[in-house]
């Protein structure tokens, strides 16, 4: 098995992940593994020398960087919070704070904004990934209601009066629950029909 450094006349290396082409010497050299950087570049007679990233710095991939990249905190002013700390092999992992969504994306989220309220009679459509986009409000399905303006309130099923031994006084709507009454209670005058004899 050929180990770096080795000559390459066609500008390609055998292991595309762990080697890179050094065009001045026409050789393939080792990249440094995640968590390390190049402390001494390769030559025709000596392979790359790697060193571990210092605290508060990282390199995520096989690389031939001569520095490690500085860890950056999640910016709360931009609505971000930390879900995993920076390590020598991985940058700080951030997400939008609860009740916010990602409004600006450049390889990762850079700016979060407050989720829009959904008006009464609607709820936010459930997303695959929390914080990925703003709310898309959809009407409550039949037999359900939601009576607030809220970014997170869910439509609830209408109360079934009969389950409580009651009778329906007023049907539920998308914005209000069913109104129930005691069977013994008389209907208000405006609701009782006039009987003609």
């Amino acid at each position: 098995q050929v180990v770096p450094p080795y000559g390459s006349e066609n500008q390609t290396c055998r292991d595309q992940e762990k080697e890179y082409y050094e065009p001045r010497h026409r050789i393939c050299c080792s990249r440094c593994p995640p968590g390390t950087y190049v402390s001494a570049k390769c030559s025709r007679s000596r392979d790359t020398v790697c060193a571990t990233c210092a605290e508060n710095s990282y390199n995520e991939h096989w690389n031939y960087l001569t520095i490690c990249q500085l860890c950056r905190p999640c910016d709360p002013v931009m609505g971000l919070e930390e879900i995993a700390p920076c390590t020598s092999k991985r940058k700080t992992q951030c997400r939008c704070q609860p009740g916010m969504f990602c409004a600006a994306w450049a390889l990762e989220c850079t700016h979060c904004e407050l989720l829009s309220d959904c008006p009464p009679g609607t709820e936010a459509e459930l997303k695959d990934e929390v914080g990925k986009g703003n709310n898309h409000c959809v009407p409550c399905k039949a037999g359900h209601f939601q009576n607030t303006s809220s970014p997170s309130a869910r439509c609830q099923p209408h109360t079934r009066c009969e389950d409580q031994g009651l009778v329906e006084a007023a049907p539920g709507t998308a914005q209000s629950d069913t109104t129930c009454r005691n069977p013994s209670e008389s209907l208000p005058p405006e609701m009782s029909g006039t009987m003609l004899m």
Epitope: Q11, T12, Q16, E17, K18, Y20, Y21, R31, N59, E60, H61, W62, N63, Y64, L65, T66, Q69, L107
Partner: nanobody, 117 residues
Framework: EVQLVESGGGLVQPGGSLRLSCAAS????????MYWYRQPPGKQRELVAI???????NYADSVKGRFTISRDNAKNTVYLQMNSLRPEDTAVYYC???????????WGQGTLVTVSS
């Protein structure tokens, strides 16, 4: 995947100038070294110029003082300004980028430069 598209090649008289461009598109992000190579008719591909991610440039002896490599990181583009062209500069010119901070090496399709009277 990253795509590289070269442009600017053509027929030019000896002593003339051309400017080659190589624009990267697709999932192009990270830290890159950028190169221009050329392949004269019937010969092997050879390195012409280097632009490293650290801002250093380097040239083949045969083009020193005549060719200039530059890059516009905002436009994801690398250029090769070729002055005082000679018949022996006739070749297909290829741009090549190699990602420094992660695996990745990409080639353009090449652009033909012909120097002839």
């Amino acid at each position: 995947e990253v795509q590289l598209v070269e442009s600017g090649g053509g027929l030019v008289q000896p002593g003339g100038s051309l400017r080659l461009s190589c624009a990267a598109s697709g999932r192009f992000f990270g830290i890159y070294d950028m190169y221009w190579y050329r392949q004269p008719p019937g010969k092997q591909r050879e390195l012409v110029a280097i632009s490293t991610s650290g801002g250093h440039t380097n040239y083949a002896d045969s083009v020193k003082g005549r060719f200039t490599i530059s890059r516009d990181n905002a436009k994801n583009t690398v250029y090769l300004q070729m002055n005082s062209l000679r018949p022996e500069d006739t070749a297909v010119y290829y741009c090549n980028i190699q990602r420094v901070d992660a695996p990745g090496m990409y080639w353009g399709q090449g652009t033909l430069v012909t120097v002839s009277s």
